[in-house]
């Protein structure tokens, strides 16, 4: 269940997809990834106010308990709901290989 | 890929399964759930330091970029990796029904 997509905190403040440009050095990949030389990393960033993009029943419970016990129970967190695949050209012991990663770039976000 | 399970912050401080006792009133369910009258909610709580229980490549990237740009990129977040089903006895328009929820109780946790 995907709940409200209206952000009560103001435009762009709630859980959504962001793009962060990162070099291979930034990612600690310079030794084993040869291409791409720079990655447009899509990730989920932002607040998860009450019922905003609640992923499931667990997220709804978390929202309720966070309201009651904010020091014990954290608010739901903005995480990927799905991913886009990405092909990396990697260094191997004897050469290079193409490898597809299915869990690297966030495609869509929700709160959980 | 599940990375290190050793918590560098001290025992119990990192991402793990916690149980929080909640009444139907706490959960806002008093109107539609008849049983159980109290729920032992299992949820994922705790910090996600570098590579601790990293769920996938995306989590590893997030760790690297959080270290570089802590004001822009948040640290990975402790969320359920899987769920335990739970049966609720619910009020319906004409009586009661048993409903199984597959996404209510966290079973296992990871960082993403």
């Amino acid at each position: 269940a995907r709940n409200g997509d209206h952000c009560p905190l103001g435009p762009g403040r709630c859980c959504r997809l962001h793009t962060v440009r990162a070099s291979l050095e930034d990612l600690g990949w310079a030794d084993w990834v040869l291409s791409p030389r720079e990655v447009q990393v899509t990730m989920c960033i932002g607040a998860c106010p009450s019922q905003f993009r609640a992923a499931n029943m667990h997220a709804q419970i978390k929202t309720s308990l966070h309201r009651l016990k904010p020091d014990t129970v954290p608010a739901p967190c903005c995480v990927p709901a799905s991913y886009n695949p990405m092909v990396l050209i990697q260094k191997t012991d004897t050469g290079v290989s193409l490898q597809t990663y299915d869990d690297l770039l966030a495609k869509d976000c929700h709160c959980i | 890929a599940r990375n290190g399970d050793h918590c560098p912050l001290g025992p119990g401080r990192c991402c793990r399964l916690h149980t929080v006792r909640a009444s139907l009133e706490d959960l806002g369910w008093a109107d539609w759930v008849l049983s159980p009258r109290e729920v032992q909610v299992t949820m994922c709580i705790g910090a996600c330091p570098s590579q601790f229980r990293a769920a996938n490549m995306h989590a590893q990237i997030k760790t690297s970029l959080h270290r570089l740009k802590p004001d822009t990129v948040p640290a990975p977040c402790c969320v359920p990796a899987s769920y335990n089903p739970m049966v609720l006895i619910q009020k319906t328009d004409t009586g009661v029904s048993l409903q199984t929820y597959d996404d209510l109780l966290a079973k296992d946790c990871h960082c993403i």
Epitope: E25, A30, D31, L34, S35, R37, I89, T94, G95, V96 | -
Partner: antibody, heavy 111, light 111 residues
Framework: VKESEGRLVTPGTPLTLTCTAS????????MSWVRQAPGKGLEWIGF?????RAYYTSWVNGRFTISKTSTTVDLKITSPTTEDTATYFC??????????WGPGTLVTVSS | AIDMTQTPSPVSATVGGTVTISCQSS????????LAWYQQKPGQPPKLLIY???TLASGVPSRFKGSGSGTQFTLTISDVQCADAATYYC???????????FGGGTEVVVK
């Protein structure tokens, strides 16, 4: 980048050439060694990763060893023969071309 | 080993004209475009002109153009200048490290 001074060595006497870099960090870049025999074409010996892992082309066959420290990239000619007489170049890069080259250093192997 | 065949030397060019050098590989380079072109003048190290088959290296005049993919590549120099007299090399990166290397070189003579 700059290679250490080349020299005259006798066959079988190991020789190490050192490459130093300024203006960029060796720990962030792949580095390559290339050689050129007098009047001949370029031969790619091998390359080393940012962390220091070395890789070689087929003809090398154990005759060379590339290593890396935080400040230098070394090429060891394990047992030089007269065929190893050449100008040796150190260069920055691997996959996207070798974009910065040293002036080269002449190694002469002769008895 | 991979055979990288370049246009036989020497290639004659006239000032203001256009010259084309080809490089043919017996195997496809990585990604179809991991090929670079270099210019070398006597007594100097090579200079990177083109990388990724068609990307102009920093500071290189747009008179130099790289094209091609897979196994067949071309370097075109338009509006040839006297300063373009040099030997030109292609170099490829392959799936196996042991195959990486340079073409035999093509000398361009400017009249």
């Amino acid at each position: 980048v700059k290679e250490s001074e080349g020299r005259l060595v006798t066959p079988g006497t190991p020789l190490t050439l050192t490459c130093t870099a300024s203006g960029f960090s060796l720990s962030s870049h792949w580095m390559s060694w290339v050689r050129q025999a007098p009047g001949k074409g370029l031969e790619w010996i091998g390359f080393v990763s940012p962390s220091g892992r070395a890789y070689y082309t087929s003809w090398v066959n154990g005759r060379f060893t590339i290593s890396k420290t935080s400040t230098t990239v070394d090429l060891k000619i394990t047992s030089p023969t007269t065929e190893d007489t050449a100008t040796y170049f150190c260069a920055r890069g691997y996959t996207s071309g070798l974009d910065i080259w040293g002036p080269g250093t002449l190694v002469t192997v002769s008895s | 080993a991979i055979d990288m065949t370049q246009t036989p030397s020497p290639v004659s060019a006239t000032v203001g004209g256009t010259v084309t050098i080809s490089c043919q590989s017996s195997k496809s380079v990585v990604n179809g475009d991991w090929l670079a072109w270099y210019q070398q003048k006597p007594g100097q190290p090579p200079k990177l002109l083109i990388y990724d088959a068609a990307t102009l290296a920093s500071g290189v005049p747009s008179r130099f153009k790289g094209s091609g993919s897979g196994t067949q590549f071309t370097l075109t120099i338009s509006d040839v200048q006297c300063a373009d007299a040099a030997t030109y090399y292609c170099a490829g990166v392959y799936n196996n490290d042991s195959d990486n290397g340079f073409g035999g070189g093509t000398e361009v003579v400017v009249k």
